[in-house]
Interface confidence: low
């Protein structure tokens, strides 16, 4: 290999061995027999050199500096070129340094053509292995701007007092243009403004200054966004840190088109505007910190350009003013990451703070609209507290379980309505009547309907999931001891339709002992399955349930078990089952860790079926599927 | 002023379970995670876990899954630490921590509960 | 799961020196360290978040450096209550863990 370098070229090349790799045979530059390890070559030089080993890719980098002197004489404005030429330099990883130094009242401008940079952060590279490192000064002081890939939407970086630029290129790498150029601007008066320009939908993540250290102190920063007029942009931060400010107040500051109050100041911590159209500008203002604990300030954010929506123009009132202990949140619904450019789905409150989820609270008027290509990329979460602190006031008070229909307007799917329904412990317990019957969801017969209504304990030690209900079935109301979470939960676009099919009542009733009772007046047609609490995990340890079952008088029930034995297996005390005629009380007591399960029975009369848990050893729980079927009575027996 | 006031000292048997109560102060309990170290007699702090006080859901160290268990009750500010069948080896002091569930450092510390397992 | 490891276990000072406590981690964690203090039957102290950023109401003889995996912390000038047990925690990633401490004592 040869280099030479031109006098007064003010290039400078450095080969030195890069990071140490653990292969077992050393590698040497070679000159003049000489074996060395690292070779620096200046304006003026010519050097000949070979290496002592077939991959030097695998051992040395390559760095190529050239200082640009623009304080003394006029500035070499324009394309900047690749010196020496890729071809003539060894196919080592390489680094082009241009370290530009001006005065302070002087603006320089890196221009890049296209492909544009997209900026990365700490620890991500870039993949095809081409970065371009950017700083600028402060005084003595280097300053980071930041490390960029190309195909992004950076097109333009100003700065003023000096620019030092790193184009790092993989030995593999066939670019021999820098693919930028330099020209002289007047003075930014501040660090520096990076031009981000969008040709259509797309998103960019920028970084403040020296990410993911501290931007400088009482430094002022401005990114220019260029957006066509026919597209959205907004903005949200995806990472901050805030200083300790002795004097002024952190910000980011908006110049936003068609806004009457420019610039508009928003806090870091505020939700960041979006649903803009066309330019507009972010300016980040640090502060003076202070001199003991400074702190530091960052800040990493994305833009996102898309289409505006049909629904970004129309505003949705969703009252909660008469609410109580009540939130509804809009938030996106799980999906599979998409490699391609997904446009955002927002939901904005007054239209202009936008986020990707919001959560409204009881006691307010809100007015929101969507900034979303589609709408069914939202769900809607609802909670509702009802409580009773005083036994004697709620004493057989109800409340309807009705979404309210300000909800079902709103052009987002419900998921989940959930009620979280609590009483005074010991004192008081609860009944939920449904006002139509509801049908327990399982293997067996699962349930088609749009929603089911999810009914679990709320106590926060209490792993009990009573079942999944669904309207068209047998079950007339169910009761349980004490708190209890109720979720109505959609599954299908359509519920929007059936709406009118969802009601439930809870009353505040006396407080009774057992778990669960469920009230059962089967219909003549179907069969009516029923199954044990908290199915996949076993009934909970020293839990009883019970079945109160209404036999019609013409009628005779078949009430059959779905297995030969319970499989349970008690560590402490005894699981049993008691079928109790409810007009002669007579009964039959089964222990269901020794017995096997009865043979299908028949019963002409209204019945109870109780189920009492022992403390089972794990992996031997208590799970009982049974059926109960009616037929006409073929003989009076009364 | 922020305060995490903890349980006192409890002398138990093999076998037998504890549990250890953090009552916060000062503070919305809900807006900062609850975190638990474990500091044996002598010896460094071992974190244990930690538990969302937005939603109550614990997340265990492996060294601390099974028979330990973190709880909450909103409604009096208080974070509880369970312990069952406990051995010789859980003898140590409890600490309460309060952190930033996105910014993991403990700011404030209860006073600590030493739970003593002597037959 | 990411091990620290302080170093030197036992530190014997008089009052008035400079102290450097180091925590080195099992791999990179950024700045993602926090230094504690702790003296006999009390709990644990926050002096140092993030490696170097310091706390209120901490004196400004301790400050912390480092990152990525090699950090110190640094008490410019030895004052006698200091005498105690330091930590470094990581909070890189779940399991948060601390380093086993050093013992910083009177010479």
């Known amino acids: 290999f040869e280099i030479a370098l031109p006098r007064e070229s003010n290039i400078t090349v450095l080969i030195k061995l890069g990071t140490p790799t653990l292969l077992a045979k050393p590698c040497y530059i070679v000159i003049s027999k000489r074996h060395i390890t690292m070779l620096s070559i200046k304006s003026g030089e010519r050097i000949v050199f070979t290496f002592s080993c077939q991959s030097p890719e695998n051992h040395f980098v390559i760095e190529i500096q050239k200082n640009i002197d623009c304080m003394s004489g006029p500035c070499p404005f324009g394309e900047v070129q690749l010196q020496p030429s890729t071809s003539l330099l060894p196919t080592l990883n390489r680094t082009f340094i241009w370290d530009v130094k001006a005065h302070k009242s002087i603006g320089l401008e890196l221009q890049f053509s296209i492909p544009r940079l997209r900026q990365i952060g700490p620890g991500e590279s870039c993949p095809d292995g081409v970065t371009h490192s950017i700083s600028g000064r402060i005084d003595a002081t280097v300053v980071r701007i930041g490390t960029f890939c190309s195909n992004g939407t950076v097109s333009r970086i100003k700065m003023q007092e000096g620019v030092k630029m790193a184009l790092h290129l993989p030995w593999f790498h066939p670019r021999n243009v820098s693919g930028f150029s330099i020209a002289n601007r007047s003075s930014i008066k501040r660090l520096c403004i990076i031009e981000s320009v969008f040709e259509g939908e797309g998103s960019a993540t920028l970084m403040s200054a020296n990410y993911p250290e501290g931007f400088p102190e009482d430094e002022l920063m401005t990114w220019q966004f260029v957006v066509p007029a026919h597209l959205r942009a907004s903005v949200s931060f995806l990472n901050f840190n805030l200083s300790n400010c002795e004097r002024k107040e952190e910000r980011v500051e908006y110049y936003i088109p068609g806004s009457t109050t420019n610039p508009e100041v928003f806090k870091l911590e505020d939700k960041q505007p979006g649903n803009m159209a066309g330019n507009f500008n972010l300016s980040l203002q640090g502060c003076d910190q202070d001199a003991q604990s400074p702190g530091i300030l960052r800040l990493q954010f994305q833009v996102l350009v898309q289409h505006p929506q049909n629904e970004s123009n129309k505003i949705y009132v969703v009252d909660l003013s008469n609410e109580r202990a009540m939130s509804l949140t809009i938030e996106p619904r799980p999906v599979k990451q998409s490699r391609k450019f997904v446009p955002g789905c927002f939901v904005c409150l007054e239209s202009r703070t936008c986020s990707s989820n919001l959560t409204l609270t009881s006691g307010s008027k809100h007015k929101i609209s969507f900034l979303c290509d589609d709408l069914t990329r939202l769900w809607m979460n609802v909670e509702k507290t009802i409580s009773c602190t005083d036994h004697r006031y709620c004493q057989r008070k109800s409340y309807s379980l009705q979404v309210p229909s300000d909800i079902l307007h709103l052009p987002v799917e419900l998921h989940d309505f959930s009620w979280k329904l609590l009483v005074p412990k010991d004192r008081l317990s609860l009944v939920l009547v449904p006002a139509q019957k509801l049908q327990q969801h399982t293997h067996e017969k699962p349930c088609n309907t749009s929603f089911s209504y999810l009914v679990a304990s709320a106590i926060p030690s209490q792993d009990l999931y009573f079942g999944s209900f669904c309207p068209g079935g047998s079950i007339k109301q169910i009761q349980v001891k004490q708190n209890i979470s109720v979720t109505l939960r959609t599954f299908a676009p359509s519920f929007q339709q059936e709406a009118s099919r969802q009601g439930l009542t809870v009353s505040f009733i006396p407080y009774f002992k057992e778990e669960g009772v469920f009230t059962v007046t089967p219909d003549t047609k179907s069969k009516v399955y029923l199954r044990t609490p908290n199915w996949d995990r076993g009934l909970p340890s020293l839990t009883s349930v019970s079945w109160n079952i209404s036999v019609p008088r013409d009628q005779v029930a078949c009430l059959t078990f779905f297995k030969e034995r319970s499989g349970v297996v008690c560590q402490t005390g005894r699981a049993f089952m008691i079928i109790q005629e409810q007009r002669t009380r007579a009964e039959e007591i089964f222990s269901l860790d020794e017995d096997v399960l009865p043979k299908p029975s028949f019963h002409h009369h209204s019945f109870w079926v109780n189920i009492s848990n022992c403390s089972p050893t794990s992996g031997k729980q208590l799970d009982l599927l049974f059926s109960v079927t009616l037929t006409p009575r073929t003989v009076d027996l009364t | 002023q922020v305060q995490l006031v903890q349980s006192g000292s409890e002398l138990k048997k093999p076998g037998a379970s504890v549990k250890v109560s953090c009552k916060a102060s000062g503070y919305t309990l809900t807006d900062f995670s609850m975190h638990w170290v474990r500091q044996a007699p002598g010896q460094g702090l071992e974190w244990m876990g930690w538990?969302?006080?937005?939603?109550?859901?614990?997340t265990y160290a492996d060294d601390f899954k099974g028979r330990f268990v973190f709880s909450l009750d909103t409604s009096v500010s208080t974070a509880y630490l369970q312990i069952s069948s406990l051995k010789a080896e859980d003898t140590a002091v409890y600490y309460c921590?309060?952190?930033?569930?996105?910014?993991?450092?403990?700011?404030?510390w209860g006073q600590g509960t030493l739970v003593t397992v002597s037959s | 799961e990411i091990v620290l490891t302080q170093s030197p276990a036992t530190l014997s000072l008089s009052p008035g020196e400079r102290a450097t406590l180091s925590c080195r981690a099992s791999?990179?964690?950024?700045?993602?360290l926090h230094w504690y203090q702790q003296k006999p039957g009390q709990s644990p102290r926050l002096l140092i978040k993030y490696a170097s950023q310091s706390i209120s109401g901490i004196p400004a003889r301790f400050s912390g450096s480092g990152s990525g995996s090699d950090f110190t912390l640094t008490i410019s000038s030895v004052e006698p209550e200091d005498f105690a047990v330091y930590y470094c925690?990581?909070?890189?990633?779940?399991?948060?863990?601390f380093g086993q401490g050093t013992k910083l004592e009177i010479k």
């Open positions: 925690q990581s909070a890189h990633s779940f399991p948060y863990t």
């Open positions: 538990i969302n006080t937005e939603t109550g859901a614990p």
């Open positions: 791999q990179s964690i950024s700045d993602f």
């Open positions: 921590s309060r952190g930033r569930d996105y910014d993991p450092h403990f700011d404030y």
